[in-house]
């Protein structure tokens, strides 16, 4: 893959480019400042850059106003003002407001509803396929084994707390130890971090609505990525995480507690329960070893159970295998000893749709899965409607200034930390950082909430799902509390290193620029969010667990050239920027790589000749399912109408930044890939029907 | 009520087999092992083998593996005991016994069959 | 092979005594020990299983205890049925092996 995807004609001086170019400004200057604006309409002017005298300035005209797409946009009011209405419209529109918060409520209710039947949905599809990764033994030598289980296990499971529940009762049981838990719980915070990108791929259908949308959501995979990056190692050199958990467990006398509110779940748990209830010990045991697991479904089936524990006598091979020597014993052929077993009696079924429906787990969590995306996406689709509804005018304004505004000088440093402190008491309110998250991406999609603002409140939600697990952790039993409570402040401390790593100094906040190059990229080529997903949460992750697998010799020797590569790609695109003249003339641009590996365009046309089929018309027959097909043909006027629709990318690909005789000054034709703008117009043009 | 009817006295010759039979009544043979013990005259116990009649699972005491074999014939309820290359130090009163269920344990004792090898 | 070891051989004994048998096991088998009683011209009898369990029909006067390598029969109040040969047995593997007997005759 390319450095930068972004670099398809690259200007012979490579660090003069356009404001707002994707990737092209790895010291682009933090946007916080600007969040105070909250009417945008001085879109900040296009900033040209002076080219060499070779170049002929005077072919440009008048620079046009190119808004920067990370601007929030305005929402412009086109009702009737309230002043204006006479009592009856006044009335109406009182009730119209009640209506749509009544709406907002209860499609917010189905989104959360939706994302925890999703959970089960995934745990369905790979759950014991999750649980069987963590029986590979290699993982106590391992930590990058480790960590890539951590990832998968979570991915699978849609859900941090399930595989980090599980490492914590194979740490009970001496399975594992914590040393080598810690780089499966850093592995479990970047898998959770799926959730919220899968929700920002709803938003697809609004170019610059996709674009703040994912780029809010990647934010938390970078941030999970660049901590794994450097706590990872740091961990494995220094133990650092082991020893201060260590330490503060050991030092307090921890009685049991009791266990963390379920706040969110109550209002929720009513409604996912007559969908499906799982049997998540069944995930857990297959990591255990637990042969007749294999075999068990984790639908639920029976929900009220008697359990009566009771001795009976079992055959051994020989006596080395009694449970006890007393309890030992032979009938004269074979041998004998006594076992305790638990004998569970069925009292009541549990009342869900799949009790009766005998179907293999598989066939559930397919059911399950393409529903429960249907419903989120849909549910996504009316909150972000009917917010983009009431979000209008002075209401937008109001709740812009109060999220986006910094304090005064000269507390504006202690902003950041009241959102982190937000996001973590949210996160602990609702119980789960995907459901914050979640919910949190379209807020950044329709331009409520600016990126900069989403980060650290995405910081505290990686805290305040640390903060349930430690409560969660007092609250275990005996022999489990040790563990489980140490496993959840190596969670904490991971989540607090990270946060010292990449907040405080805003030159060190990387994830959001990377986010927003990532957003600049998606936007543009839409189909490149799913491959980014696929990478990033299953092709790396498999590839390196299938390395670790063939022994670390091969992973090592694949993965130091692979290190090296990209470690020397980075040092090239940081000289480039930052002194290309240190360079030779032939290494400062990506001209002489071929064009497939500096830029996204051939790899689009291939995807464009995969889809060929939606490239022409895109079939927006639902407003659900045409997502689907606008980020596989990337038609430009998806979900405007219900019907059919012609795609005339092709026609606006021309407008530009006007130039008088681009045919003769090629050399500098300063291309859109290149900025990673889309006219605003792009994505809001009605579709013409067919 | 549990009964056990062992054959008559035999006399053999060294060399020779003796083959004892042991009628069971009175619970399902099947169920229960059989196990065999002989006592020479005058002397203790000493425990031969044991048969499963439901599988026809055997095990023997290391001393007579080779020597003894038990069978059984589930239709008429009866177990037998064949114990060949006789000794004269074989002379003992063969009894055959019912075990206790899984255990190790005799509850119910033939009456005993007098095998006396002499030349 | 575990080797059952009763003590004593033969013992005199009046009626309404109280009479002590035990046995000693060459290794630990738990508690997989039982008692016979056998009477002259008779087939053994089964007294005790489980080292203390009575076998159905069995008189309340006889109790086994122990466990590991040391057995104990206890007939706490001898009654002339009683006078016989006794035999400990373990049961923890094969081979099963007995006890050569303890022999209670009247004083």
């Known amino acids: 893959m390319a450095p930068w995807p972004e670099l398809g004609d690259a200007q012979p001086n490579p660090d003069k480019y356009l404001e707002g170019a994707a990737g092209q400004q790895p010291t682009a200057p933090d946007k916080s400042k600007e969040t105070n604006k909250t009417d945008n309409t001085e879109a900040p002017v296009t900033k040209i850059e002076l080219l060499p005298s070779y170049s002929t300035a005077t072919l440009i005209d008048e620079p046009t106003e190119v808004d920067d797409p990370w601007n929030l946009p305005t929402l412009q009011d086109s009702g009737i003002k309230w002043s204006e209405r006479d009592t009856k419209g006044k009335i109406l529109c009182f009730f119209q407001g009640i209506g749509r918060l009544i709406l907002l409520l209860g499609f917010l209710y189905f989104f959360v509803c939706s994302l925890d039947i999703l959970s089960s949905a995934f745990q369905l599809v790979g759950g014991k396929m999750a649980g069987q990764f963590f029986s590979n033994s290699s993982i106590m030598s391992n930590p990058l084994l480790g960590l890539v289980i951590g990832v998968l296990v979570t991915v699978l499971v849609q859900s941090s707390s399930t595989s980090t529940s599980i490492v914590v009762s194979m740490v009970s049981s001496s399975l594992l130890t914590v040393r080598a838990a810690i780089p499966i719980i850093m592995g479990a915070n970047i898998g959770t971090s799926i959730t919220n990108t899968i929700v920002a791929l709803m938003q697809v259908g609004d170019r610059s609505e996709f674009r703040r949308a994912f780029a809010g959501a990647t934010v938390h995979d970078f941030f999970n990525w660049l901590s794994v990056l450097v706590l990872l190692p740091v961990e494995v050199a220094t133990h650092y995480l082991e020893i201060i958990t260590q330490l503060i467990v050991e030092s307090f006398h921890f009685k049991n507690g009791e266990d963390a509110p379920d706040l969110l779940k109550v209002i929720t748990k009513p409604f996912t329960k007559l969908i499906v209830q799982l049997d998540k010990k069944v995930i857990s045991q297959i990591a255990m070893n637990d042969e007749k697991a294999k075999n068990k479904s984790l639908v639920k089936i029976w929900c009220k159970t008697f359990t009566n524990k009771t001795q009976i006598n079992v055959t051994v091979p020989s006596t080395a295998n009694c449970t006890s020597p007393s309890l030992c014993w032979t009938d004269g052929i074979q041998n004998w000893t006594m076992k305790n077993v638990t004998y569970k009696e069925n009292i009541a079924k549990c009342q869900h749709i799949f009790v009766n429906f005998h179907l293999p787990d598989l066939a559930v969590g397919t059911i399950l899965l393409i529903l429960s995306l249907l419903v989120l996406c849909g549910c996504l689709i009316m909150i972000v409607k009917i917010l983009g509804s009431v979000l209008k005018g002075q209401v937008a304004t109001v709740i812009k200034k109060t999220i986006n505004t910094d304090f005064p000088f000269p507390f504006a440093w202690l902003t950041g930390y009241l959102a982190i402190l937000v996001g973590a008491g949210m996160t602990f309110i609702v119980q789960s950082s995907s459901v914050f998250t979640s919910a949190l991406t379209p807020l950044i999609g329709i331009g409520v909430i600016t990126i900069e603002r989403a980060y650290p409140l995405t910081l505290g939600s990686n805290i305040g799902t640390t903060t349930t697990a430690i409560l969660a952790a007092l609250a275990s039993p005996g022999n489990a509390l040790r563990s489980s409570l140490q496993i959840a402040l190596c969670h904490f401390f991971f989540n607090i290193s990270g946060i010292l790593l990449w907040y405080p100094i805003p030159f060190t906040r990387l994830p959001i620029r990377m986010a927003k190059g990532l957003g600049n990229i998606s936007a543009k080529y839409r189909w490149f969010a799913v491959f980014y997903l696929i990478i990033f949460f299953f092709l790396i992750p498999l590839t390196v667990f299938g390395l670790s697998l063939a022994g670390w010799r091969v992973l090592v020797g694949v993965g130091v050239p692979v290190v090296f590569i990209i470690i020397l790609v980075l040092c090239l695109r940081l000289l480039q920027s930052r002194c290309p003249r240190v360079l030779p003339k032939k290494l400062q641009n990506w001209n002489f790589l071929p064009l497939w590996m500096r830029s996204l365009k051939p790899w689009d046309a291939v995807v464009s000749k995969f889809t060929g089929c939606f490239q022409m018309r895109c079939c927006c027959c639902c407003r659900v399912c045409c997502r689907a097909c606008c980020l596989l043909c990337d038609c430009p006027k998806c979900c405007r109408c219900s019907k059919c629709c012609e795609d005339l990318e092709e026609a606006q690909e021309g407008q530009d930044v006007p130039v008088k005789a681009p045919e003769t000054f090629d050399n500098i034709t300063i291309s859109r890939e290149a900025q990673g703008e889309v006219p605003a117009s792009d994505s809001k043009t009605e579709c013409t029907a067919l | 009520q549990v009964q056990l009817v062992e054959s008559g006295a035999e006399v053999k010759q060294p060399g020779e087999s003796v083959k004892v039979s042991c009628k069971a009544s009175?619970?399902?043979?099947?169920?229960?092992?059989m196990h065999w013990v002989r006592q020479a005259p005058g002397q203790g116990l000493e425990w031969m083998g044991a048969?499963?009649?439901?599988?026809?699972?055997?095990g023997y005491s290391q001393k007579f593996q080779g020597r003894v074999t038990l069978t059984v014939d589930k239709s008429a309820s009866t177990a037998y005991m064949e114990l060949s290359s006789l000794r004269s130090e074989d002379t003992a009163v063969y009894f055959c016994v019912r075990g206790g269920r899984g255990l190790g344990t005799m509850d119910y004792w033939g009456q005993g069959t007098l095998v006396t090898v002499s030349s | 092979d575990i080797q059952m070891t009763q003590s004593p051989s033969f013992l005199s004994a009046s009626v309404g005594d109280r009479v002590t048998i035990t046995c000693s096991a060459s290794q630990d088998v738990g508690s997989s020990v039982a008692w016979y009683q056998q009477k002259p011209g008779q087939s053994p009898k089964l007294l005790i299983y489980?080292?203390?369990t009575r076998h159905t029909g069995v008189p309340s006067r006889f109790s086994g205890s122990g466990s590991g390598t040391d057995f104990t029969l206890t007939i706490s109040s001898l009654q002339p049925e009683d006078f016989a040969t006794y035999y400990c047995q373990h049961y923890r593997n094969i081979p099963l092996t007995f006890g050569q007997g303890t022999k209670v005759e009247i004083k």
């Open positions: 489980w080292a203390s």
């Open positions: 048969i499963y009649p439901g599988s026809g699972n055997t």
């Open positions: 009175g619970y399902t043979f099947a169920s229960y092992n």
